[in-house]
Amino acid sequence: FGISGKHFITVTTFTSAGNIGEDGTLSCTFEPDIKLNGIVIQWLKEGIKGLVHEFKEGKDDLSQQHEMFRGRTAVFADQVVVGNASLRLKNVQLTDAGTYTCYIHTSKGKGNANLEYKTGAFSMPEINVDYNASSESLRCEAPRWFPQPTVAWASQVDQGANFSEVSNTSFELNSENVTMKVVSVLYNVTINNTYSCMIENDIAKATGDIKVTDSEVKRRSQLELLNSG
C-alpha cells in the first residue's frame, strides 16, 4: 500500500463558501505529525499555474505562489502540528471560486483532497415595521447578496400562503457593481403574528423573523451556508 516506503495519509476537506470582500477559509485537516519540519502543505487551484500557498520546514515558502494570491494567504502556523492545514484567504473575490487541492506530505506519508470553493455575497436580513406606509407593512433589508437571490415571505398564522401578490422586492446594485442590496416590503400585515422573510441563492439562505404584537416587536435573524460538508 505504501509508495517508496511511505503510506497514504488521510486528508479531509469540505466544500465551503467565501463572502466577497471578507476573509475566507479553505478547510483542510490531516493526520497530525509532531515533526513540524517534516510537514509540507501545498494548496493548488485547478486552472492556475503555480501554487496558491506552500508551507514547509515550519514556515511559508511563497517562491512558486501565483500572483493572484500574493499577500492574500496564510496557514494557521501554530495549528499545523495538530493536523490543521486550513488556508486563510484575504479579501475573497468572485474569481477565487473553483476547485482547490490540499496536498500534504509528512513523515508518516502523503495524501491529498479536493474542495469546491464557492464565492458570492450573503448577509443577514433585518426586518422592521414600516410606519411610513399607508397600511401596516414590513420592510426586510439585506445589504449584500450575489448572485441575485430569491425572496419569499411566510407567516405563522397563514402557513402555506403565497405572499407574492402582497409584497414587492427590489435589488439595488451596490457601489462596487457586483453585490446587491435586497429590499422586500410586505403589505397588509396583521398584528399578533410572526412573519418570516427568506432570502436564498445557491450559496446561502438567510431568514429574518419578526413577531408583532400590541405591546412589542421581537426580531430574530439567521444565516446558513448551503451545500457545506
Epitope: K59, D60, L62, G71, T73, R88, E176
Partner: antibody, heavy 121, light 107 residues
Framework: EVQLVQSGAEVKKPGASVKVSCKAS????????IGWVRQAPGQGLEWIGD????????NYNEKFKGRVTITRDTSTSTAYLELSSLRSEDTAVYYC??????????????WGQGTLVTVSS | DIQMTQSPSSLSASVGDRVTITCKAS??????VAWYQQKPGKAPKLLIY???TLQPGVPSRFSGSGSGRDYTLTISSLQPEDFATYYC?????????FGQGTKVEIK
C-alpha cells in the same frame, strides 16, 4: 517581543538619495510583510510600500514609483527603504512597520521609532 | 486605487464625551479598515483592524463599525489620554491608503 529598530536621522541635499534601515527582532523576519510609511512635518501618514522578506515581493505607492526601492537582507533581518532624487517635500519622518498576518498582508501592528530625513540645500 | 476620505479633520471634545470619526472609501467593499492613534513625536498605535476587531490591550471604549464604503471609529467615553490624532487605513486593496487624520482636542 516584536521590535523594529531604525537607523538614525539623515540630512541630504536635493537630488541626492537616502537609504533608511529597519532591523527586526522577536519574530521570524521572513514570514511577515514589512511596510514603510512617511509623515511630513505637521501632516498625515502616507503609505509608501511594502516587502515580503521571504520572497522579496514588493508593492509601491504609484506616487513613489521609480524613485523608491524597498529591499531586505534576510541574513541580518533588516529591511531597507531607498528614496532617490530627493526634494524638499520629501522631508519627513519615515517609519517601518510589520504587517499583521504573516504571509497574509494585514494591518501594520508593530512600528519602528521613525527616522527623520531632512532634505535641504 | 482606493482613497479614504476622513472627517472631521479636527474636533474639540470634553472628557466623558462620545466621539465619532468617519472614513469613506472611494470605491468597492471590503472589511479591511484599521484605525490608528498617534500622539506627537510617537509612532502610530493600532487600535482596531478588520473594521471592528479590537487590538489586544486596547481599551473597550474604542469600537469600530461600518460596511459598504462607510466606516466609523467611536470612543464611547473620552479619557484624558485619548486626546491625539486618529487615522483610518484601508488595507484590502493591493495599494494601502490612509485617511487624512482627525485631531481630537480638548474643549
Amino acid at each position: 517581543e516584536v521590535q523594529l529598530v531604525q537607523s538614525g536621522a539623515e540630512v541630504k541635499k536635493p537630488g541626492a538619495s537616502v537609504k533608511v534601515s529597519c532591523k527586526a527582532s522577536g519574530y521570524t523576519f521572513t514570514s511577515y510583510w514589512i511596510g514603510w510609511v512617511r509623515q511630513a512635518p505637521g501632516q498625515g501618514l502616507e503609505w509608501i510600500g511594502d516587502i515580503y522578506p521571504g520572497g522579496g515581493y514588493t508593492n509601491y505607492n504609484e506616487k513613489f514609483k521609480g524613485r523608491v526601492t524597498i529591499t531586505r537582507d534576510t541574513s541580518t533581518s533588516t529591511a531597507y527603504l531607498e528614496l532617490s532624487s530627493l526634494r524638499s517635500e520629501d522631508t519627513a519622518v519615515y517609519y517601518c512597520a510589520r504587517l499583521d498576518g504573516s504571509s497574509y498582508r494585514g494591518a501594520m501592528d508593530s512600528w519602528g521609532q521613525g527616522t527623520l530625513v531632512t532634505v535641504s540645500s | 486605487d482606493i482613497q479614504m476620505t476622513q472627517s472631521p479633520s479636527s474636533l474639540s471634545a470634553s472628557v466623558g464625551d462620545r466621539v465619532t470619526i468617519t472614513c469613506k472609501a472611494s470605491q468597492g467593499f471590503n472589511k479591511y479598515v484599521a484605525w490608528y492613534q498617534q500622539k506627537p513625536g510617537k509612532a502610530p498605535k493600532l487600535l482596531i483592524y478588520y473594521t471592528s476587531t479590537l487590538q489586544p490591550g486596547v481599551p473597550s471604549r474604542f469600537s469600530g463599525s461600518g460596511s459598504g464604503r462607510d466606516y466609523t471609529l467611536t470612543i464611547s467615553s473620552l479619557q484624558p489620554e485619548d486626546f491625539a490624532t486618529y487615522y483610518c487605513l484601508q488595507y484590502g486593496d493591493l495599494l494601502y491608503a490612509f485617511g487624512q487624520g482627525t485631531k481630537v482636542e480638548i474643549k
